[in-house]
Interface confidence: low
C-alpha cells in the first residue's frame, strides 16, 4: 500500500499474507473458516503457465491473523482465470474465528458504483517499494470505467485501442473487472496487495463485504487506477466449488 | 333427576356422590382437586340447626368419579348460610385429577340470563322416586327471576308474598339466587341432587363453568323451577376460605 | 468468551437429578449454543430432548446436529470510517 | 397417557452426554411438565437449568419449583350438546 | 432517515391482552434485527425481546416469556409485540429498537418514541 | 446471568466539569458494553457500542473505556444538554441482555 494507515486495531482480520515461490509476497481474503479467495496470477507466480493446481500448492505458505500459519490442503483455479483472474484456496483444517481472524462476507447484491468508496488492506509494497511489516489500509474510490479502460488501453472503442499502461503491464479489464483509485493523496496498492478485498461496509447490516479483489497491483500511484475482479460474479462458482470440495 | 339422560361417557367428572347421616343421598360438586362445594342444608340433613361444622364432618361419606370413596378432612359452612345455602368441604388428601375425577371451573363473568341452557347432572330421585344407580343428566333453561319468585310467592311485592310452593316446601330465593327448569318435556331435578352444578360451557373458552350450585331440589317436576345460589357470588369467599385453610 | 454455566463441563457425564413436583415431572433439554463470532445454524431451534433410546433429538432437525458457522463481516475492532 | 420420553424414567440419575458441536458448547436444561388434566404453575417459565454450584435454577423463580396444578373444566368425554 | 414508530398502547385490566406493532422506514428492513425494551415508571430500561433478520432467532427475557410473543411482517416492515396475561408490573413505556448488527444480540442504535402500557383494574 | 452494577446512582455535576460513570459486570463480557443516554419521556439514545466505539452523530467529548469486568463513560466537558440519566448494558449471543441500574447525572 502507498500512504495509508497501518491497521493498529485489527480492522481487517480476512487478510491473509501469501509468500509464492521464492519468496514473493502476495494477498488472499478469507471468505469462510476454511477457504480464501486470491489471484490466479499470485497463484502462478514463478510457475510456468502450464503448471497444475497441484504442482502450485505445496510451494505457497499461508499466514492469517499475527502470523498465525495455516496449512494448505488445495488450490482451485477458476475455470476461465485468463479471463476472471481468480483462485480458491481450501485450508487443511478450519481456523479458529476470533477478533483477529474473520472471514468477510460475499456480496449478493452488487455495491459497485462510481464514488464509492472501499477499503483495501495488504502486505504489499510501500512508498519505498518495500514490502510492509505491518499491514496498511488504504480507502479508495470506485472510479468511473470508461476513464479506466482509456487510461490503460486508449480508448473504450475496441478497434482503437492500444495497449497505454503507464507501468508498461496491462491488466485484465472487462465485464467482470472495475477499477478503483487514485486518492488525491497518491495513496494506492502496489505490488503485493493483490488477492486483496476491497471491502465495503454495509451500513444498514453492519457488516463488511468483499466487492472486489484485487487483481492488478502494478499501478503504485504511478498508474491511476488498480483493477478488481467483481465479487459478484464470483459468487456463485464460489460456492459451488466450496460445496463440492 | 327427572327424566334427562344417562352419562354413560363420565362426561360431568365433577360430579360427587355425598350420603348424609342415615344414609341419604345427595350431591356435591368438585372445585379443585381438594374442595367440593354441596348446599348447607345436605350438611345439616338429620342434624339439627345447632349441629356445629365439626359434629358434621364424621357424618358424611363421600364419593367420587366411579364410585372413588375420598375421605374428608373438614367441613366450612358459609357464614350466611341460612340466606347463601352453600358449605365447603375439603378432604384429607388431594384426588388424582383424572377423566373421571376433575374439578369444574368457578366462573369470573356472570353466565346467567333467561333462556341461556345449563346442564345438571345429579344422584338424585328419578321419575319412579327413587335414588339412581347411574349418573343421569338434564338439560335446563335459566328462567325469568320474576316468574319463578310469583311461582314460590305468590308476588314480586314483599306485602302481598304468601308461600305458594306446589310442593309445600319453599325455596331460598333472593338476589344470590337464580331459577331454572322445567324443559317441554317435563325434566327436572329432584331431592339429592342439591349439590350439584348448574354447568354451563363457554365455546369460547371450551371450558366448563359451575354458574350455580342446586339449592331447592324439591321441585321435581311438580313445582317449575329448581333455585340455585349464583357461583359469582361465591367465588371470593371460597378463594379465601381455600387459603386460610 | 462463554459464560461459566453455559459452557460447563459434565466431567461425569451426568448431570444431577432435578427435584420432582407432584402430578409433574421433568423433560430434559440441551440448548446449543455458540462461541463468540460464530452463529447457529440449525433445521430446528437447536432445543433437544432425549427420546426413549436416550438419543438427542430436535422435533425439527431429529438426530441432526446443528453447526456453528463463523460470522463473516463483523470485525471486532472496525476501522474508523471518515464520512 | 403422557408420551414415554416426556415422563421417562431417569434411573440412574443421569443423562447421557449430548454430542459435542465445532465451537459450540451445550447449556443443560430441564424443562418441568405436568401430566395429563394438570397445568404448570411457575413464577419463570418452568425451564430450569444448571449453576455452577450444579443446582437447578430458575431465571426468575430461582431455586423455587413450579407446581402442577389440576385442571377444571375441560372433561375428556363432553356430554354431546345440542344446538 | 431512519424511523420506528410504536403504536398499540393503552389501558387493559390485568389478565388481558395487547399487541403493539412498530412500523420502520428508512433502512432494509428485513436485514436488521429488532428488539423490544421498557421502561418501567421510576424503574430502569428492561430488555424484552429480540428478532434477528432471520425469524428463527428469536430471544426473550424470563420475565415475560410465556406470556409475551415477539414477531415481524417484512412484507409491512412491521415489528410486533404479542402481549397476554398482563399484570399490574407490565405497566412501562414501551420501545422498539433497531439493533446495530443484522444478529440478534448487538446493541440498538435506533429507537422510537416509545408506547404506553397501563395494566390497571 | 449477568449482573450491571452502576455507580454513582446519582451524580451531581456542574458545566464543564470532567464526569465519569463507572459501570461493572458480574462476569467477563469481553467488549460487548454499550452505553445509553436517556432523557425524561425520550426514548434512549446509544452513545458507545463495543465499550469504547462512538455512535454516529455522538459528540466526542463522550468516550468508553473498559473491557472483561470495568468499564467506564467519560464526560470530558459537561453541557447543559447532557443532564439525563445513563445506562450500560452488556449484550453477547449469550442473552438476556443486562442493563445498568442507570445513573441519574443532574445540575449540582
Known amino acids: 500500500i502507498i500512504g495509508g494507515s497501518m491497521d493498529a486495531k485489527g480492522s481487517f482480520p480476512w487478510q491473509a499474507k501469501m509468500i509464492s515461490r521464492h519468496g514473493l509476497t502476495t494477498g488472499a481474503t478469507l471468505i469462510s473458516d476454511q477457504w480464501l479467495l486470491t489471484t490466479a496470477k499470485n497463484l502462478f507466480l514463478n510457475h510456468s503457465e502450464t503448471a497444475s493446481a497441484k504442482d502450485i500448492t505445496p510451494t505457497l505458505t499461508l499466514y492469517v491473523g499475527k502470523n498465525q500459519l495455516v496449512e494448505i490442503e488445495k488450490v482451485v483455479l477458476h475455470p476461465n482465470h485468463s479471463v476472471v483472474d481468480i483462485g480458491l484456496i481450501k485450508l487443511k483444517q478450519r481456523v479458529l474465528v476470533t477478533e483477529r481472524v474473520m472471514p468477510i462476507c460475499l456480496p449478493s447484491k452488487d455495491y459497485i458504483a462510481p464514488g464509492r468508496v472501499g477499503y483495501v488492506s495488504g502486505w504489499g509494497r510501500n512508498a519505498n517499494f518495500r514490502f510492509t511489516d505491518r499491514l496498511k489500509y488504504v480507502m479508495l474510490p470506485v472510479a468511473d470505467q470508461d476513464k479506466c479502460v482509456v487510461h490503460y488501453e486508449n480508448s473504450t472503442v475496441p478497434e482503437k485501442k492500444n495497449l497505454t499502461s503507464p507501468v508498461g503491464v496491462q491488466p485484465i479489464l472487462n465485464e467482470h473487472t472495475f477499477c478503483a483509485g487514485l486518492t488525491k493523496y497518491q495513496e494506492d496498492t502496489c505490488y503485493g496487495d493483490a488477492g486483496s478485498a476491497f471491502a465495503i461496509h454495509d451500513m444498514e447490516e453492519d457488516t463488511w463485504y468483499a466487492a472486489g479483489i484485487l487483481s492488478f497491483d502494478k499501478s503504485c500511484a504511478v498508474a491511476e487506477y488498480g483493477v478488481y475482479v467483481r465479487a459478484t460474479d464470483l459468487k456463485d462458482w464460489v460456492q459451488e466449488t466450496m460445496a463440492k470440495n | 333427576i327427572i327424566g334427562g339422560s344417562m352419562d354413560a361417557k363420565g362426561s360431568f367428572p365433577w360430579q360427587a356422590k355425598m350420603i348424609s347421616r342415615h344414609g341419604l343421598t345427595t350431591g356435591a360438586t368438585l372445585i379443585s382437586d381438594q374442595w367440593l362445594l354441596t348446599t348447607a342444608k345436605n350438611l345439616f340433613l338429620n342434624h339439627s340447626e345447632t349441629a356445629s361444622a365439626k359434629d358434621i364432618t364424621p357424618t358424611l361419606t363421600l364419593y367420587v368419579g366411579k364410585n372413588q370413596l375420598v375421605e374428608i378432612e373438614k367441613v366450612v359452612l358459609h357464614p350466611n348460610h341460612s340466606v347463601v345455602d352453600i358449605g365447603l368441604i375439603k378432604l384429607k388428601q388431594r384426588v388424582l385429577v383424572t377423566e373421571r375425577v376433575m374439578p369444574i371451573c368457578l366462573p369470573s363473568k356472570d353466565y346467567i340470563a333467561p333462556g341461556r341452557v345449563g346442564y345438571v347432572s345429579g344422584w338424585g330421585r328419578n321419575a319412579n322416586f327413587r335414588f339412581t344407580d347411574r349418573l343421569k343428566y338434564v338439560m335446563l333453561p335459566v328462567a325469568d327471576q320474576d316468574k319463578c319468585v310469583v311461582h314460590y310467592e305468590n308476588s314480586t311485592v314483599p306485602e302481598k308474598k304468601n308461600l305458594t310452593s306446589p310442593v309445600g316446601v319453599q325455596p331460598i330465593l333472593n338476589e344470590h339466587t337464580f331459577c331454572a327448569g322445567l324443559t317441554k318435556y317435563q325434566e327436572d331435578t329432584c331431592y339429592g341432587d342439591a349439590g350439584s352444578a348448574f354447568a354451563i360451557h363457554d365455546m369460547e373458552e371450551d371450558t366448563w363453568y359451575a354458574a350455580g350450585i342446586l339449592s331447592f331440589d324439591k321441585s321435581c317436576a311438580v313445582a317449575e323451577y329448581g333455585v340455585y345460589v349464583r357461583a359469582t357470588d361465591l367465588k371470593d369467599w371460597v378463594q379465601e376460605t381455600m387459603a386460610k385453610n | 468468551v462463554e459464560l461459566g454455566n453455559d459452557a460447563m463441563d459434565f466431567e461425569d457425564d451426568s448431570c444431577p437429578k432435578p427435584p420432582e413436583i407432584a402430578n409433574g415431572y421433568v423433560e430434559h433439554l440441551v440448548r446449543y449454543r455458540c462461541r463468540q463470532f460464530y452463529r447457529l445454524r440449525a433445521e430446528g431451534d437447536g432445543v433437544y430432548t432425549l427420546n426413549d433410546e436416550k438419543q438427542w433429538v430436535n422435533t425439527v432437525a431429529g438426530e441432526k446436529l446443528p453447526e456453528c458457522e463463523a460470522v463473516c463481516g463483523k470485525p471486532k475492532h472496525p476501522v474508523d470510517q471518515v464520512q | 397417557v403422557e408420551l414415554g420420553n416426556d415422563a421417562m424414567d431417569f434411573e440412574d440419575d443421569s443423562c447421557p452426554k449430548p454430542p459435542e458441536i465445532a465451537n459450540g458448547y451445550v447449556e443443560h436444561l430441564v424443562r418441568y411438565r405436568c401430566r395429563q388434566f394438570y397445568r404448570l404453575r411457575a413464577e419463570g417459565d418452568g425451564v430450569y437449568t444448571l449453576n455452577d454450584e450444579k443446582q437447578w435454577v430458575n431465571t426468575v423463580a430461582g431455586e423455587k419449583l413450579p407446581e402442577c396444578e389440576a385442571v377444571c373444566g375441560k372433561p375428556k368425554h363432553p356430554v354431546d350438546q345440542v344446538q | 432517515e431512519v424511523h420506528l414508530l410504536e403504536s398499540g398502547g393503552g389501558l387493559v385490566q390485568p389478565g388481558g391482552s395487547l399487541r403493539l406493532s412498530c412500523q420502520a422506514s428508512?433502512?432494509?428492513?428485513?436485514?436488521?434485527?429488532m428488539s423490544w425494551v421498557r421502561r418501567a415508571p421510576g424503574k430502569g430500561l428492561e430488555w424484552i425481546s429480540s428478532?434477528?433478520?432471520?425469524?428463527?432467532?428469536?430471544y426473550t427475557a424470563d420475565s415475560v416469556k410465556g406470556r409475551f410473543t415477539i414477531s415481524r411482517d417484512n412484507s409491512k416492515n412491521t415489528l410486533y409485540l404479542q402481549m397476554n396475561s398482563l399484570r399490574a408490573e407490565d405497566t412501562a413505556a414501551y420501545y422498539c429498537?433497531?439493533?446495530?448488527?443484522?444478529?440478534?444480540?448487538?446493541?440498538?442504535?435506533?429507537w422510537g418514541q416509545g408506547t404506553t402500557v397501563t395494566v390497571s383494574s | 446471568d449477568i449482573q450491571m452494577t452502576q455507580s454513582p446512582s446519582t451524580l451531581s455535576a456542574s458545566v464543564g466539569d470532567r464526569v465519569t460513570i463507572t459501570c461493572r459486570a458480574s462476569?467477563?463480557?469481553?467488549?460487548?458494553l454499550a452505553w445509553y443516554q436517556q432523557k425524561p419521556g425520550k426514548a434512549p439514545k446509544l452513545l458507545i457500542y463495543?465499550?469504547?466505539s462512538l455512535e454516529s452523530e455522538v459528540p466526542s467529548r463522550f468516550s468508553g473505556s473498559g473491557s472483561g469486568t470495568e468499564f467506564t463513560l467519560t464526560i470530558s466537558s459537561l453541557q447543559p444538554d447532557d443532564f439525563a440519566t445513563y445506562y450500560c448494558?452488556?449484550?453477547?449471543?449469550?442473552?438476556?441482555?443486562?442493563f445498568g441500574q442507570g445513573t441519574n447525572l443532574e445540575i449540582k
Open positions: 429498537a433497531k439493533n446495530r448488527d443484522r444478529y440478534s444480540y448487538d446493541a440498538w442504535s435506533v
Open positions: 428508512g433502512f432494509t428492513f428485513n436485514s436488521n434485527a
Open positions: 428478532i434477528g433478520a432471520n425469524t428463527n432467532y428469536i
Open positions: 462476569q467477563s463480557i469481553d467488549i460487548w
Open positions: 463495543e465499550a469504547s
Open positions: 448494558q452488556a449484550y453477547n449471543s449469550n442473552y438476556p441482555y443486562a
